[in-house]
Interface confidence: medium
């Protein structure tokens, strides 16, 4: 029988290269059993993680897993940085690995590359 502990499956050292001005959904995959835990997002600032209280979030439910989504509508240059989700479950705090957003400001890019091109050619971010 499967464990009923809550697990947060953000990949260790995961990164997303995104463009300022685009919408983006940052997903926190959450595994739970009976009761959905309270999940929050925070943004790392040095050694502390600042809770993102006023941001739009939503849940997406799939067959074997749920996603707690942080919405960026649109992405802003200062969204660059590392994020973490955490869950409160039976008085325990469970924290995910951090995930990093690399935001390219389209104003500084001479030509706007496609998302797929950015994913396959990350050096475009640093032109």
């Amino acid at each position: 029988k499967e464990s009923c502990d809550v697990q947060l499956y953000i990949k260790r050292q995961s990164e997303h290269s995104i463009l300022a001005g685009d919408p983006f959904e940052l997903e926190c995959p959450v595994k739970y059993c009976a009761n959905r835990p309270h999940v929050t997002w925070c943004k790392l600032n040095g050694t502390t993680c600042v809770k993102l209280e006023d941001r739009q979030t939503s849940w997406k439910e799939e067959k074997n897993i749920s996603f707690f989504i942080l919405h960026f509508e649109p992405v802003l240059p200062n969204d660059n940085g590392s994020y973490r989700c955490s869950a409160n479950f039976q008085s325990n705090l469970i924290e995910s690995h951090s995930t990093t957003l690399y935001v390219t400001d389209v104003k500084s890019a001479s030509e706007r590359p496609s998302k797929d091109e950015m994913a396959s050619r990350p050096w475009l971010l640093y032109r």
């Epitope: 697990q7 499956y9 260790r12 997303h16 290269s17 595994k31 950015m118």
Partner: antibody, heavy 118, light 111 residues
């Protein structure tokens, strides 16, 4: 049902570039993680890398200078490119999906056998 | 990289008996608060097939003769009872840390 199918050449000359395609049906490559794995003649399995739902990539450091993984979301395909191949790259190449929930590989392609020889 | 050492390299078991395959990791597999160790079966000419995920969970459609156990650095795949159709090579895999790695494989034969 999720199905993956590899396609590409069966023979490549040393120093050339290998290009493989993985065509996915039954799921969108804008969800989960999409991987390349190879199996050498001695039966050793090597993980090569992935492209994620968002388009971010990870490459095994042992291949990092030679490998590229890209995708075409409208065709629901992803691609492996391996530069400067040698006879050591002779292997069966598999594409596979890994789930968010533990990253295990739940669906695999049948594999395509590559020989590197002049 | 996390090195996975499988033992034995080959195994001959009589029909109806128990087969036990071990996988030892060079580092602890628990960074997600979970054991991201998985087991695959590969028959000749076929791709690997997922049997057990996250150390002990049986993949849908896999017979209950297969079971997985273990945590931290020591993991075990058990087949009980062994059937003729189980002749294959079995691999453990960790997805706790990049790059993902596989064990060297255990070839199961019928005695």
């Amino acid at each position: 049902e999720v199905q993956l199918q590899e396609s590409g050449p069966s023979l490549v000359k040393p120093s050339q570039t290998l290009s493989l395609t993985c065509s996915v049906t039954g799921d969108s490559i804008t969800s989960a993680y999409w991987n390349w794995i190879r199996k050498f003649p001695g039966n050793k399995l090597e993980y090569m890398g992935y492209i994620s739902y968002s388009g971010s990539t990870y490459f095994n450091p042992s291949l990092k200078s030679r490998i590229s993984i890209t995708r075409n979301t409208s065709k629901n395909q992803y691609y492996l490119q391996l530069n400067s191949v040698t006879t050591e790259d002779t292997a069966t190449y598999y594409c596979a999906r890994s789930h968010y929930y533990g990253y295990y590989f739940d669906y695999w392609g049948h594999g395509t056998t590559l020989t590197v020889s002049s | 990289d996390i090195v996975l050492t499988q033992s034995p390299a080959s195994l001959a078991v009589s029909l109806g008996q128990r087969a036990t395959i071990s996988c030892r990791a060079s580092e602890t597999i628990d960074s997600y608060g979970d054991s991201l160790m998985h087991w695959y079966q590969q028959k000749a000419g076929q791709p690997p097939k997922l049997l057990i995920y996250r150390a002990s969970n049986l993949e849908s459609g896999i017979p209950a003769r297969f079971s997985g156990s273990g945590s931290r650095t020591d993991f075990t795949l058990t087949i009980n009872p062994v059937e003729a159709d189980d002749v294959a090579t079995y691999y453990c895999q960790q997805t706790d840390e990049d790059p993902y790695t596989f064990g060297g494989g255990t070839k199961l034969e019928i005695k």
